[in-house]
């Protein structure tokens, strides 16, 4: 599948920062999502996890961006082996982990899809 260019990764990082900066109230009313393995293929896995959160405007742009990074169509209820299916975490924690790892990839120039 297509590898996200560095500009697209920068935009994703910026959006993840936008929705977490100085944020103490639970994102998406404290919704829980499946944790994922932060490895190659993580963008599709992240989308598969976050797409199950509906009615949360704060993450809609992130969902759209991840759709652009994922080569196949993802729909609610769809799961890949990249999910750690025994662990659910809050959306805010999920976003923070995703941000941290995306920055790591960006710094090292490894734009994994």
């Amino acid at each position: 599948g297509p590898v996200p260019p560095s500009t697209a990764l920068r935009e994703l990082i910026e959006e993840l920062v936008n929705i977490t900066q100085n944020q103490k109230a639970p994102l998406c009313n404290g919704s829980m999502v499946w944790s994922i393995n932060l490895t190659a293929g993580m963008y599709c896995a992240a989308l598969e996890s976050l797409i199950n959160v509906s009615g949360c405007s704060a993450i809609e742009k992130t969902q759209r961006m991840l759709s652009g990074f994922c080569p196949h169509k993802v729909s609610a209820g769809q799961f890949s082996s990249l999910h750690v299916r025994d662990t659910k975490i809050e959306v805010a924690h999920f976003i923070t982990k995703l941000l941290s790892y995306t920055k790591q990839l960006f710094r090292h120039g490894q734009q994994f899809n």
Partner: antibody
């Protein structure tokens, strides 16, 4: 030693321009979000604006009174923050501080740490 | 534009508890930060993210937040705590910072 040192302040006429610099040392400047804060004589602290680290987008935000007149920039290769001030007004007279931005501390490696410069005085008067 | 409201002054006797409040509409969802500024000096962070204390700040300084109000508490105030205190936070977007008007703490010696 962790420190910020401002320079560039001085006396300028209304409508004039000035560029302040803030030299950082002792911490990873490139990872830090940085802010400018000012304090008019005998008044309280006023947030001027901030710049995110490059990795976090490098975007800038400004307070309404300075938006369109002031520009914050950074040069990570020189560990230096800048504040370009144009169309200066008498009400811009203040001590200007540069500081690590606490909102950005969450994303940098200075979480729970606080660094401010000693301040540089800007006087706008005819 | 977004504002944070603080009382202009608070007075306590040495050893008493001083409480300084800060109110703002976005505080239920955004963290508050507290700075101490002594005359002629740069501000010093005493509380971050509502209630966390930076290293080197005495334990008598604590912070809390409930609803639209953040509170800085100095338990057993000392003469050296006399200073101006400012709360700092952001608007609901998180993009724009704001300081409260400041509170002058007087510790009656």
């Amino acid at each position: 030693e962790v420190q910020l040192v401002e320079s560039g302040g001085g006396l300028v006429k209304p409508g004039g321009s000035l560029r302040l610099s803030c030299a950082a040392s002792g911490f990873t400047f490139s990872n830090a979000w940085m802010s400018w804060v000012r304090q008019a004589p005998g008044k309280g602290l006023e947030w001027v604006g901030r710049i995110r680290s490059e990795i976090d987008g490098g975007t800038t935000n400004y307070a309404a009174p300075v938006k369109g007149r002031f520009t914050i920039s950074r040069d990570d290769s020189k560990n230096t923050l800048y504040l370009q001030m144009n169309s200066l007004r008498t009400e811009d007279t203040a001590v200007y501080y540069c500081a690590t931005d606490q909102v950005g501390a969450y994303y940098g490696d200075y979480y729970g740490m606080d660094v401010w410069g000693q301040g540089t005085t800007v006087t706008v008067s005819s | 534009s977004y504002e944070l409201t603080q009382p202009p002054s608070v007075s306590v006797s040495p050893g008493q508890t001083a409480r300084i409040t800060c109110s703002g509409d976005a505080l239920p969802e955004k963290y508050a930060y507290w700075y101490q500024q002594k005359s002629g000096q740069a501000p010093v962070l005493v509380i971050y993210e509502d209630s966390k204390r930076p290293s080197g700040i005495p334990e008598r300084f604590s912070g809390s937040s409930s609803g639209t109000m953040a509170t800085l508490t100095i338990s057993g105030a000392q003469v050296e705590d006399e200073a101006d205190y400012y709360c700092h936070s952001t608007d609901s977007s998180g993009n724009h910072g704001v300081f409260g008007g400041g509170t002058k703490l007087t510790v009656l010696g």
